[in-house]
Interface confidence: medium
């Protein structure tokens, strides 16, 4: 396929990598819905990778909502060890690993970790609590997994999805569906195209995980979700590489994936200026 480069990867039986998603809806944000009831429910938080409590309003919302902590854990976490993928070629670091640490404008004094491109190591810094850039990790382990050199492990999971005939959107299935593909790219690649709330008509691309291709759509200029790219190439880079086609029961498989951080923030850039 001329649209994207390929890497070869080998499956090895070792420890689980950090993120253990079993269903795509486990990546959805907690949604309290528009109603005003106060109901204690649980959702899976992809950033903390834990089931957490939230208050549900009683109507609408999404599938990342469970009556009990146990049900949430059962649906969204895995206790059994699984396989991880090790790349035979060196993984390319995400661009944000090369950003300098950014405290943000606020005045908190929170310990965070960033990848220092000079020392090639993850180091501690003090974060102000708001804004900042993506080179900002809550744990040293997360920083190392994403930005430091060495083999990166990825969770291998199946995601069952179906096309909703009414609005042509992606609907996650509540049960695992056998699939020719396994997805461990950014969770937003599984979400439907979302025009957003404004009135513009900007040409954008989204990843359609049902057909496995990047498709154009009209973006309103604000809102929407992260499955939104300014070019087809950017879309393919971010999402197409997340799918692994299973060509045999084990051994060598093809992957089209470069590691991306789950949290999405607009990156700051350092600027150097001279006094005029």
């Amino acid at each position: 396929d001329s649209e994207e480069d390929e890497e070869h990867t080998i499956i090895t039986d070792t420890e689980l990598p950090p993120l253990k998603l079993m269903h795509s809806f486990c990546a959805f944000k907690a949604d309290d819905g528009p109603c005003k009831a106060i109901m204690k429910r649980f959702f899976f938080n992809i950033f903390t990778r834990q089931c957490e409590e939230f208050i549900y309003g009683g109507c609408e919302g999404n599938q990342n909502r469970f009556e009990s902590l146990e049900e949430c854990k059962k649906m969204c976490t895995r206790d059994n060890a699984n396989r991880i993928i090790k790349t035979t070629l060196q993984q390319e670091k995400p661009d944000f690993c090369f950003l300098e640490e950014d405290p943000g404008i606020c005045r908190g004094y929170i310990t965070r970790y960033f990848y220092n491109n000079q020392t090639k190591q993850c180091e501690r810094f003090k974060y102000g609590g708001c804004l900042g850039n993506m080179n900002n990790f809550e744990t040293l382990e997360e920083c190392k997994n994403i930005c430091e050199d060495g083999p990166n492990g990825f969770q291998v999971d199946n995601y069952g999805t179906q096309l909703n005939a009414v609005n042509n959107s992606l609907t996650p299935q509540s049960t695992k569906v056998p699939s020719l593909f396994e997805f461990h790219g950014p969770s937003w690649c599984l979400t439907p195209a979302d025009r957003g709330l404004c009135r513009a008509n900007e040409n954008r691309f989204y990843y359609n995980s049902v057909i496995g291709k990047c498709r154009p759509f009209k973006y309103s200029g604000c809102g929407g979700n992260e499955n939104n790219f300014t070019s087809k190439q950017e879309c393919l880079r971010a999402c197409k590489k997340g799918f692994i086609q299973r060509i045999s029961k084990g051994g060598l498989i093809k992957t089209k994936r470069k590691r991306k951080k789950q949290r999405v923030k607009i990156a700051y850039e350092e600027i150097f200026v001279k006094n005029m």
Epitope: C130, E270, I271
Partner: antibody
């Protein structure tokens, strides 16, 4: 009392560069406890934050994605001011442009008077 | 981006009445980073409320803010003639910082 005084042309031709300056009195552009922003307002878009600069032992900036490829905000410490440059403007960039101080404890607590910039040939 | 949706778009009330303006965020926002502004025609916005519930300097006590998470409210307990204006909420919890589309409070 902090005051922000804006200056710059009100008419810019399409494809040219919009340049505005915001002079600060009562605070320093190099303050370790503020950020200096540009915000614009048009009927179609409402209030739209464009970007800011701030100093925390070195200079940082952040720009809105919608203008990131065209915008530059620079401080001028000698004159205690900061500037906005927006390249390759189109009629869509017609708006009232405001400079503002972003106090991290409060929000935008001081604003310039606003400059209506019309992009037209 | 965090989208802030304000409702209603327009509120038609008489002086002396109570105004309740809503701001709903598309995802959680720390209340420390949620502000409200008032804007009158031909003027720059003016900071009214910070940290979701604290009045800025010089703001009358009839203005109050409340809320947390994704739902925030600005209340004007008894409208004065000078309160008829457009009100905006704003978050600077996550980059890029964003404003709501505004609620216009007009005289009935």
């Amino acid at each position: 009392q902090v005051q922000l005084q804006q200056s710059g042309p009100g008419l810019v031709k399409p494809s040219q560069t919009l340049s505005l300056t915001c002079a600060i009195s009562g605070d320093s552009v190099s303050s370790n406890s503020a950020a200096w922003s540009w915000i614009r307002q048009s009927p179609g878009r409402g209030l739209e934050w464009l970007g800011f600069i701030y100093y925390r032992s070195k200079w940082y900036n952040d720009y809105a994605v919608s203008v990131k490829s065209r915008i530059t905000i620079n401080p001028d410490t000698s004159k205690n001011q900061f500037s906005l440059q927006l390249n390759s403007v189109t009629p869509e960039d017609t708006a009232v442009y405001y400079c503002a101080r972003h106090n991290p404890d409060l929000g935008f607590d001081y604003w310039g008077q606003g400059t209506l910039v019309t992009v037209s040939s | 981006d965090i989208v802030l949706t304000q409702s209603p778009a327009t509120l038609s009330l008489s002086p002396g009445e109570r105004a309740t303006l809503s701001c709903r965020a598309s995802q959680n926002v720390s209340s420390n980073y949620l502000a409200w502004y008032q804007q009158k025609p031909g003027q720059a916005p003016r900071l009214l409320i910070y940290d979701a519930s604290n009045r800025a300097t010089g703001v009358p006590a009839r203005f109050s803010g409340s809320g947390s998470g994704t739902d925030f409210t600005l209340t004007i307990s008894s409208l004065e003639p000078e309160d008829f204006a457009v009100y905006y909420c704003q978050q600077f919890y996550d980059s890029p910082q964003t404003f709501g589309q505004g609620t216009k409070v007009e005289i009935k």
